[in-house]
């Protein structure tokens, strides 16, 4: 048999707090325990769940946990079932609510001397005890002119008068806790002699030179006084108007009219109502002068077909706030469709090429109207007008590769040469239409070129191969004047290139044939042993079939190369003495001699009195000084070659003779004594 060791029992519980209904079972077989609430099985949730055989509540809920709970134990094998005693919760709770007007039916019906009933919508279990407050002060039972029942939630004021005006609130408490009204009620019962607002002036915005009207009315018994004041507290009446309010009129009904409004009229106006009793009622309204600023400029916009784009129009600052609308081709845009206005935005959905053009954002208010245009371009993918083509360009001449495309906006064209971006420089120029000009075609310009034409909508590209048609030219051009050493072997080279390999031959300029000791070997003129007769003018001729022939003239001179007969020697001279550096050279043509001292050429015309160069080439320096020390170079040159030789010059102090030295003792170095 199934036996309940612990059964659930009814208990007090607090809303939102923990609770546990206990249930423990003993049985011979395996039993399955579950719970019923008002006869229906209880499903586990995070808030309410079985814990062992007991039912645990993480937070009791007065709505979901009201009813009768029962623990059921069942042996699934035998089918035997046992049910516990019923158990329920006495749930304690309190919930805040507003203070509402119960009587009369609406605030408008509240009059002095009528009965007013307020109701406190705080509920709870057990039933709460209520406390009423006016302007935060507790109201006690039996207080003059009102009856308050703390058992009930109603507050009755009978009869209601101006002294009952105030902010009414309530609080309530029970065994669960305390709550106060979530929304309070303001009771306003006017004293008939107090000034009451019938019509309050409103802020107005007017354009310059327009008129402005402020309405203001009060009521009271007896009728109240009404007065208008401007910012600086200056009273405005029809009899005494301040200078800056000459065009102000106060009407019998209290309205104030201002005509031809100027900036100085802008400001705060006060309408003051004073009853027989009570404080003055002050109402304020501001007069604003309408204004509208300029609109910021739009950047031109480039959009691609098929996309959705928006252009926001920032309305100019203005008073009143300017209204904004978009126009295209003079027509106001709709608020829906493919091209439409949404708020301040121009929306272009699924852009078409035909949407390109000028759109205008308008802004307007009382002060006037402003407009700003935005230019919308719908980008298209470039199309070819002329693609670059494989080209044969002539060496040394300008060459052109075309990359002509059309698109909106104008496409950007860039060129690549061997995958390297081409810059503009002295040899390459890119025209704005995309044409590439190679100013002076060189052999190595023969390669691949690629142009890319792009817009925001996309790119197209094409490539072309350039073949350079080589000029027929000497490589390198022979020197026009050359020397050969007499009685020696000599060669004069001549080579050329062209579209086809040229043949090269030499001939004498006078047309005579070459002597037998002179051979022409594949463009190299070879002299086995140079004679005086070999001097003269020769012509190298390079020719091929397609390009004809070119000629290079060379004047050959036969010379005896320079040798030194006398070379300068290392020389040491006493300070103040004269130094002689000898140098003599021979050759044909007869060589000229120049001297270089201390790394500069000694100009014979500017040597000064101390230095002199003799006809035979020797250099003499009189009255030598220490700064004359250094390396001196003798340079011998003629039209065929140049040679040089050098020697150092030392300038030393003359030693003072010692006793032991005989008059004939030689100095320790080679010395010139003069």
């Amino acid at each position: 048999a199934i036996v309940f060791i612990k059964q659930p029992s009814s208990q007090d519980a607090l809303q939102g707090r923990r609770a546990l209904l206990r249930c423990e079972v003993e049985a011979p077989g395996l039993v399955h325990v579950y719970w019923l609430l008002d006869g229906a099985p209880v499903q586990d949730t995070e808030r309410r769940f079985t814990q062992g055989s007991s039912l645990s509540f993480a937070a009791v809920d007065r709505l979901q946990d009201s009813g009768t709970f029962q623990c059921v134990a069942r042996d699934d094998v035998t089918g035997e079932e046992a049910r516990s005693a019923n158990a329920s919760f006495n749930i304690k709770w309190i919930e805040a609510g507003p203070v509402v007007l119960k009587h009369p039916a609406s605030e408008a019906e509240i009059q002095p001397q009528t009965q007013v009933t307020l109701r406190c919508h705080i509920d709870g279990h057990p039933r709460p005890t209520y406390q009423w407050f006016r302007d935060g002060t507790p109201l006690s039972d039996g207080q003059s002119n009102n009856t308050v029942s703390s058992k009930e939630r109603n507050l009755t004021l009978r009869p209601a008068g101006p002294e009952h005006s105030g902010l009414y609130s309530c609080c309530a408490h029970n065994a669960f806790g305390q709550a106060c009204s979530s929304q309070n009620f303001t009771l306003s019962i006017a004293d008939e002699s107090f000034a009451r607002v019938v019509l309050a002036p409103q802020d107005v915005i007017v354009a310059r030179n327009e008129e402005a009207m402020f309405h203001c009315q009060f009521s009271a018994q007896p009728p109240p006084n009404l007065q208008w004041l401007f910012e600086d507290e200056t009273p405005i009446t029809n009899r005494s108007r301040p200078p800056h309010l000459r065009r102000a009129t106060v009407f019998a009904n209290g309205s104030l009219l201002l005509t031809q409004v100027r900036p100085r009229n802008a400001g705060v106006y006060r309408c003051i109502g004073q009853g027989q009793r009570g404080p003055p009622v002050i109402l304020e309204a501001t007069l604003h002068l309408a204004e509208i600023e300029d609109m910021p400029l739009f950047e031109p916009r480039v959009f691609t077909a098929g996309s959705e784009e928006r252009v926001t129009c920032l309305p100019p600052k203005g008073l009143p706030e300017p209204s904004v609308w978009w126009e295209h081709a003079g027509v106001r845009l709709p608020t829906h469709g493919r091209v439409y206005q949404k708020g301040h935005e121009l929306v272009l959905a699924s852009i078409a090429e035909s949407d390109a053009g000028v759109y205008t954002c308008h802004a307007a208010n009382l002060a006037g109207q402003r407009r700003q245009d935005v230019n919308i371009t719908v980008a298209t993918v470039p199309t070819w007008l002329k693609k670059p083509q494989d080209s044969q360009l002539e060496e040394g001449k300008p060459g052109y590769l075309h990359c002509l495309t059309q698109a909106t906006p104008k496409p950007t064209v860039v060129w690549y040469r061997n995958q390297m971006l081409i810059s503009e420089d002295s040899r390459f120029e890119v025209f704005k239409n995309g044409t590439l000009r190679i100013n002076n075609v060189e052999v190595y310009d023969g390669t691949w070129y690629r142009c890319v034409s792009s817009t925001p909508a996309g790119s197209i590209e094409a490539q072309a191969r350039v073949q350079v048609l080589e000029k027929l030219k000497f490589t390198p051009p022979p020197q026009p004047q050359q020397c050969m050493e007499f009685d020696k072997e000599a060669t004069v080279p001549c080579s050329a290139t062209g579209r086809e390999k040229p043949t090269i031959k030499w001939e004498r300029a006078d047309g005579s044939s070459l002597p037998e000791w002179v051979t022409d070997n594949a463009g190299t003129l070879h002299f086995a042993r140079v004679t005086r007769d070999d001097a003269g003018n020769y012509t190298c001729i390079a020719s091929n079939g397609p390009q004809g022939q070119i000629r290079a003239h060379v004047q050959l001179t036969v010379a005896v190369f320079i040798t030194f007969k006398v070379e300068p020697e290392r020389t040491t001279v006493y300070q103040g003495h004269t130094a002689l550096l000898q140098c003599e050279a021979q050759g044909d043509p007869k060589p000229l001699i120049q001297w270089k001292g201390k790394d500069r050429i000694l100009d014979p015309t500017k040597l000064g009195p101390r230095m002199h160069i003799f006809q035979n080439g020797s250099l003499v320096i009189h009255d030598v000084a220490p700064e004359d020390s250094g390396r001196y170079t003798c340079i011998a040159g003629n039209s065929c070659n140049i040679k040089h030789t050098e020697a150092p010059l030392y300038v030393v102090d003359k030693p003072v003779p010692e006793e032991s030295e005989g008059p004939g003792s030689p100095p320790p170095y080679k010395m010139i004594q003069t």
Epitope: V413, V414, E424, D425, V430, F431, K432, V452, S454, S459
Partner: antibody, heavy 117, light 111 residues
């Protein structure tokens, strides 16, 4: 060779207008875009705008819209920059330059405009 | 408008050493697979001279010691080894979109 020769220095009174010229040699201005760039004393560079001399199409930086006007005369191969209502803020060197693509490889020598009362 | 921020404003580098100038764009200057960032050198009384175009390509006649790198929004100009003749103002410039804009400039001097 490519050259951009700019007009000489100008000393102007505030409120006056001035027209600067840029004469090209070694190329036809119709084949390129011409740009104008401003440089105030010891300051950075400001792009004023560019003109396509072939059709007179212009683009300006927002700061110069309305304050500067670019024109070109293809018959004399010359571009012009017109500055009106001059103020001290317009005291600067103005350069003209040339592009075929998107990099400025050639510049004029510059024209100094001084605005002083 | 695309704003270019150059740093540092001035730089002193010893002869033979490396000078690096940075330029940051307020938005990407890449388009059509090209970075439209260019570098100019300017000496007193002279117009600017194109050093580097399209971020990393050397202008005509520009010595190999000048090199540029970067893409998107971050770019740099390197000068190595620094020579006496490199004392000048250096400007970055974007030509991705109108208006073309320049960086504030970097004054490069010899330490």
């Amino acid at each position: 060779q490519v050259q951009l020769q700019q007009s000489g220095a100008e000393l102007m009174r505030p409120g006056a207008s001035v027209r600067l010229s840029c004469t090209a040699s070694g190329f036809d201005i119709k084949d390129y875009y011409l740009h104008w760039v401003k440089q105030r004393p010891d300051q950075g560079l400001e792009w004023i705008g560019r003109i396509d001399p072939e059709d007179g199409d212009t683009e300006y930086a927002p700061n110069f819209q309305g304050a500067a006007t670019m024109t070109a005369d293809t018959s004399s191969n010359t571009a012009y920059l017109h500055l009106n209502s001059l103020t001290s803020g317009d005291t600067a060197v103005y350069y003209c330059s040339r592009t075929g693509t998107r990099w400025i490889a050639y510049w004029g020598q510059g024209t100094l405009v001084t605005v002083s009362a | 408008d695309i704003v270019l921020t150059q740093s540092p404003a001035s730089l002193a580098v010893s002869l033979g050493q490396r000078a690096t100038i940075s330029c940051r764009a307020s938005e990407s200057v890449d388009n059509y697979g090209i970075s439209f960032m260019n570098w100019f050198q300017q000496k007193p009384g002279q117009p600017p001279k194109l050093l580097i175009y399209a971020a990393s390509n050397q202008g005509s006649g520009v010595p190999a010691r000048f090199s540029g790198s970067g893409s998107g929004t971050d770019f740099s100009l390197n000068i190595h080894p620094m020579e006496e003749d490199d004392t000048a103002m250096y400007f970055c410039q974007q030509s991705k979109e109108v208006p073309w804009t320049f960086g504030g400039g970097t004054k490069l001097e010899i330490k």
